[in-house]
């Protein structure tokens, strides 16, 4: 069971300091941006991180949403990352959900975060280069010191 708590607005970056944004095709991508680029590209660079109370404490349970025309929420259904047009729900009556991730700091580095899927144990949000694009993907990872699964989250509110 997950019960919604508060939400915050955040900019998410990979460890190469590229900014996560949602492109015109609703794809989550990373790109080099100056702070002014990041502001100019809002709201596509501003993510709503909603925190949830978890009936089995396993870290901070969160959803990641973005509000362009409508609110879309990050999902890892079938291990594929996509934004689905939906509001983060107030309650989820299950111990797993394709839209819930556990946000945890990397040991010894409070500013570096990992996001583990609640649906797929050992699968993490990751940045992966595909041709010329840096994509947000779900990655099965047993190399937990891999920088591709680490992010910084900067609160904007």
């Amino acid at each position: 069971y997950f019960g919604k708590l508060e939400s915050k607005l955040s900019v998410i970056r990979n460890l190469n300091d590229q900014v996560l944004f949602i492109d015109q095709g609703n794809r989550p991508l990373f790109e080099d941006m100056t702070d002014s680029d990041c502001r100019d590209n809002a709201p596509r660079t501003i993510f709503i991180i909603s925190m949830y109370k978890d009936s089995q404490p396993r870290g901070m349970a969160v959803t990641i949403s973005v509000k362009c025309e409508k609110i879309s929420t990050l999902s890892c259904e079938n291990k594929i990352i996509s934004f689905k047009e939906m509001n983060p729900p107030d309650n989820i009556k299950d111990t797993k959900s394709d839209i819930i991730f556990f946000q945890r700091s990397v040991p010894g580095h409070d500013n570096k975060m990992q996001f583990e899927s609640s649906s797929y144990e050992g699968y993490f949000l990751a940045c992966e280069k595909e041709r010329d694009l840096f994509k947000l993907i779900l990655k099965k990872e047993d190399e937990l010191g891999d920088r591709s699964i680490m992010f910084t989250v900067q609160n904007e509110d």
Epitope: P57, V106, G108, K140, D142, G145, D146
Partner: antibody, heavy 126, light 107 residues
Framework: QVQLVQSGAEVKKPGASVKVSCKVS????????FHWVRQAPGKGLEWMGR????????KYAERFKDRVTMTEDTSTDTAYMELSSLRSEDTAVYYC???????????????????WGQGTLVTVSS | DIQMTQSPSSVSASVGDRVTITCLAS??????LTWYQQKPGKAPKLLIY???KLQDGVPSRFSGSGSGTDYTLTISSLQPEDFATYYC?????????FGQGTKLEIK
């Protein structure tokens, strides 16, 4: 309690290949990997590589990647490690071990080699 | 590759002594470090994971500490069954690398 049972000792000639098996007995959760570690007589532990039973993907240590093949048979819960072009310095005890997530009180994951096989002595001698 | 430098390579001690073994990583390994005990002719046995978390069933005289690149295994009061070889292992990045081992012998 998970147990790993390895195949018996082998004596091989230089240039030959050896295939060591590792069978899981007992209840094991999903989301584990098999790793192989070797230990030459009187020496330390050396990581050789790992296989993911879910998709058979492998990661090998650079020094073994041209000679080692790790496979897994999900139907029998058995992992295999084959080492080719054997030389005398490959004489060692070869261990299989499971690599699984342990968690701390906040749910943070740590991968751990928890269950180990009894070891298989491979002797390479002409 | 991440190098793990373990010291000392051997140590002589008596029952009841306090013993400390260190492992130095060549880069930050984010506490993804485990400690193993190995007795002659046996497979290694997990003692500590995540740098400081005691594996179930391991006596509380064993403890681990450290972060970043520096890690320590401490045995607070040596018992006869503790004489063995100890290894650290970094699990942060592939290839996984072990320390060279510390042989703990009876003085």
């Amino acid at each position: 309690q998970v147990q790993l049972v390895q195949s018996g000792a082998e004596v091989k000639k230089p240039g030959a290949s050896v295939k060591v098996s590792c069978k899981v007995s007992g209840e094991i959760s999903t989301g584990y990997y098999f790793h192989w570690v070797r230990q030459a007589p009187g020496k330390g532990l050396e990581w050789m590589g790992r296989i993911d039973p879910e998709d058979d993907s492998t990661k090998y240590a650079e020094r073994f990647k041209d000679r080692v093949t790790m496979t897994e048979d999900t139907s029998t819960d058995t992992a295999y490690m084959e080492l080719s072009s054997l030389r005398s310095e490959d004489t060692a005890v070869y261990y299989c071990t499971t690599w699984r997530i342990y968690r701390d009180s906040s749910g943070r994951p740590f991968y751990v080699m928890d269950a180990w096989g009894q070891g298989t002595l491979v002797t390479v001698s002409s | 590759d991440i190098q793990m430098t373990q010291s000392p390579s051997s140590v002589s001690a008596s029952v009841g002594d306090r013993v400390t073994i260190t492992c130095l990583a060549s880069e930050d390994i984010y506490t993804y470090l485990t400690w193993y005990q190995q007795k002659p002719g046996k497979a290694p046995k997990l003692l500590i994971y995540g740098a400081n978390k005691l594996q179930d069933g391991v006596p509380s005289r064993f403890s681990g500490s450290g972060s970043g690149t520096d890690y320590t295994l401490t045995i607070s009061s040596l018992q006869p069954e503790d004489f063995a070889t100890y290894y650290c292992l970094q699990g942060s990045k592939f290839p996984l690398t072990f320390g060279q081992g510390t042989k703990l012998e009876i003085k």
